[in-house]
């Protein structure tokens, strides 16, 4: 067992909120059984930890929100992996169980005397985790103990099912909406034949299922569908890329309902195999506008069109985060490890099992260098605020006219908290309304991003459109410098006049060969030639038949030419 996972970030308070963030990358295939996590993460990890700590500080200093009640937290590392997250969730539950037994006077010392030991406060709710697959596993456990869970990026459609996931809510929309947005983009550019890739796991599987269902209804064909784990080895990604090339040049568009690290795996394989520019990747919000996906592989990613949940940067978070330093930031137990990883240097006096870095960290180092805010920061903060407003409304209802925690809130009843959370609505960090429908989901608003080469060796994401409640808006001129540049992704070209489509046995409806109708036939529909009736002949445009005018011979007409059989 890796010691890094035993690390927990604590902040004291009257009410404790749990949180699961992917502070480290998921274990690689060979380390899964040990549950040994990967490298430390900045956007998805450290920034989210700091967001939780600082957001709680802001809530606690807000006199109008939970007055006389201090919110605290216990943050654990999910490593973007179900087994690790479950292990950490059990720790949350264990704390809650011990606390509730204590409330009921069930905690006794071995000699039978009463215990004076105070255990940790119970967790009233959990923020996160990021991954849908992991969130499902965590929810399966939390709901047994009536602990509400608010997710900030788990978008799987399955999580909308309240019969299965009663205590789950989210400040993001269900993936059914971005699947629709992706299909709308495919339709817009008349791509009728695309390859499909998804990340193995709930997010990718359910998202791709929705994409395929919607595509079929729109007459879009899937050349082939492939799945892969984000932590699959190079060989697996190479094989997948080779399979995708077998559908070129017809299926140039690859719809990827993928986690960011799956996309990165594809880009790396494109580099190894010499396939930059051969595909246009259409990516879901797992990719969005993340630089950790494209770093070092920008050439391979150029042209990519991605879906991003609408969430502007949070200025006040940057103001706080960019001032953090390892010598003063002790409440985040992962911060020193992150600092060393970020700047590839060694901190003086920091215990290092294996001193990976030779140079000592310079005191002038600052997080301002190459800073990129986590694209889902707004959602993380909104999830924390949702919990606070839910608790606030619950306190107002259970403790009228009382500032602080009244007896009716000791211990906090998860069922009542869930009820209160579902009714919560407030203005979010970006000025938008945060509310939950009957499934605990939030409304869907997306930005459409395009990864472009902006100048020599300078690449960036630019906003090229939006999808809001079913309406797609795209700036086509920004995506394609001229109409002729629009990539084609079709199996067969339209047939010429007087030809019909013949779909080969076992082929999808988008793949056909064009066959001309016979001399006496017209095009009945796009798949059928029909012979004109006796006495009629196909029209010039071959869309029907005209009667052949009858010409009668009269006396005086020249005799028709004929040849005798005997004539040689």
């Amino acid at each position: 067992q890796s010691s890094e996972r035993r690390v927990v970030a604590h902040m004291p308070g009257d009410i404790i909120i749990g949180a699961l963030f992917s502070v480290h990358h998921q274990p690689t295939v060979d380390k899964v059984h040990e549950r040994k996590c990967g490298a430390v993460r900045e956007q998805y990890g450290i920034q989210r930890v700091e967001a939780m700590l600082h957001t709680l500080e802001r809530i606690n200093s807000d006199p109008t929100l939970l007055p006389n009640i201090t919110l605290g937290c216990e943050i654990r590392d999910s490593c973007w992996h179900s087994a690790v997250a479950l292990e950490q969730s059990i720790e949350f539950i264990r704390d809650s169980l011990i606390s509730s037994e204590e409330e009921e006077g069930l905690v006794r010392c071995v000699d039978g005397s009463s215990s004076s030991f105070r255990s940790k406060k119970p967790i009233v709710g959990v923020i996160g985790p990021g991954s849908s697959s992991v969130a499902i596993q965590v929810q399966n456990l939390l709901q047994l103990f009536n602990i509400p869970q608010i997710a900030y990026s788990a978008t799987s459609m399955d999580l909308s099912d309240k019969t299965l996931f009663k205590y789950f809510m989210r400040v993001v929309p269900s993936d059914a909406q971005q699947a629709r947005a992706m299909v709308d983009i495919v339709k817009r550019y008349n791509w009728t034949y695309v390859s499909a890739v998804h990340t193995e796991g709930n997010y990718g599987e359910s998202g791709m299922e929705a994409f395929k269902d919607m595509s079929a209804k729109e007459g879009i064909c899937i050349a082939h569908s492939y799945k892969i784990y984000s932590n699959a080895g190079e060989q697996s990604f190479d094989k997948l890329l080779k399979k995708l090339t077998s559908h070129l040049p017809k299926a140039r568009v690859v719809a990827c309902f993928c986690e960011g690290m799956t996309v990165r795996g594809l880009l790396m394989a494109m580099r190894r195999l010499g396939l930059a520019g051969e595909f246009l990747l259409l990516g879901s919000d797992g990719w969005a506008d993340r630089y950790d996906v494209t770093d070092g592989y920008q050439r391979e990613a150029v042209g990519g069109i991605t879906i991003k949940l609408q969430s502007p940067d949070v200025k006040w978070f940057d103001d706080y985060y960019l001032k953090l330093r390892p010598e003063t930031n002790h409440r985040n137990p992962w911060f020193q490890e992150f600092w060393q990883h970020r700047f590839q240097c060694r901190l003086e006096g920091f215990p290092q099992e294996n001193s990976k870095y030779n140079k000592t960290c310079d005191s002038s180092l600052t997080l301002k260098t190459h800073h990129v805010q986590d694209s889902k920061m707004g959602f993380v903060i909104n999830a924390i605020y949702s919990m606070a407003y839910g608790l606030h409304n619950m306190q107002m209802s259970l403790c009228p006219g009382y500032a602080g925690l009244c007896d009716a809130m000791k211990p906090i009843d998860g069922r009542k908290l869930l009820e209160s959370l579902m009714k919560t609505n407030f203005t979010g960090v970006s000025g938008d309304m945060i509310l939950f429908d009957e499934n605990g989901d939030s409304p869907g608003r997306y930005e459409i991003m395009n990864f472009k080469e902006m100048g020599k060796d300078y690449f960036d994401y630019i906003n090229v459109g939006s999808w809001d409640n079913g309406e797609l808006k795209m700036d086509d001129d920004e995506v394609w410098s001229k109409k002729s540049n629009i990539i084609r992704s079709v199996c067969s070209e339209p047939c010429e006049k007087g030809q019909i489509k013949v779909i080969r046995k076992g082929e999808v409806s988008c793949c056909w060969t064009c066959t001309p109708c016979k001399e006496n036939e017209y095009v009945f529909d796009e798949y059928t030639c029909k012979a004109c009736q006796l006495g009629s002949w196909p029209t010039d445009d071959l869309t029907g038949c005209d009667l052949i005018p009858v010409q009668y011979l009269r006396w005086g007409d020249p005799e028709p030419d004929y040849k005798d059989d005997d004539d040689k």
């Epitope: 190479d238 080779k242 070129l248």
Partner: antibody, heavy 116, light 110 residues
Framework: QSVEESGGRLVTPGTPLTLTCTVS????????MGWVRHVPGKGLEWIGI?????STYYASWAKGRFTISKTSTTVDLKITSPTTEDTATYFC?????????????WGPGTLVTVSS | AYDMTQTPASVSEPVGGTVTIKCQAS??????LSWYQQKPGQPPKLLIY???TLASGVSSRFKGSGSGTEYTLTISDLECDDAAAYYC????????????FGGGTEVVVK
Amino acid sequence: QSVEESGGRLVTPGTPLTLTCTVSGFSLSRYAMGWVRHVPGKGLEWIGIIYASGSTYYASWAKGRFTISKTSTTVDLKITSPTTEDTATYFCARSRTATYDAVDPWGPGTLVTVSS
Amino acid sequence: AYDMTQTPASVSEPVGGTVTIKCQASQSISSYLSWYQQKPGQPPKLLIYEASTLASGVSSRFKGSGSGTEYTLTISDLECDDAAAYYCQQDLSGSNLDNSFGGGTEVVVK
């Protein structure tokens, strides 16, 4: 479906030479085309490949010395400044797919002799 | 780069015998390997692709196997017409064309 090389001849060192591969029975917009050479007494060596999309890749030793381009029915290999080491039989071959892959069919080859 | 090393450089076997040619890649090529036969004065001919798939019109006496970095071509029931040079080729990466072909194996049929 066939491919055939032409343009091989005796040239003096430094005189640019263009070999042409003419294809029939398939479209160059659907298949990648490669150039391979066989130096007498040695094995086969890849020079470069042009994908259906038009992207080109070369062996590191061939970069700058060779250029591959195509029209709708032909693929050209330009030897920019031949040296005596470039004496070989040059083959043009079609990839099984739109990018790099196993190659089939092959042309009969065209002989290039570089000599002063 | 995916460097291909072929052994042996030459082999001699009687008619009816069996020849085994090995090809090793410097790193995994995920079974993207093809085998070619070349007779003097002729272009190479594709025998096998994707490590074990027989090209059309090729005799089933030719068998390809292997995965990862190790691959084998086996020619059984040798015929006089099998006398030729045989080459393996990595079919995985077009951006690494150096040494994509093995050095070749000369097969002599006695």
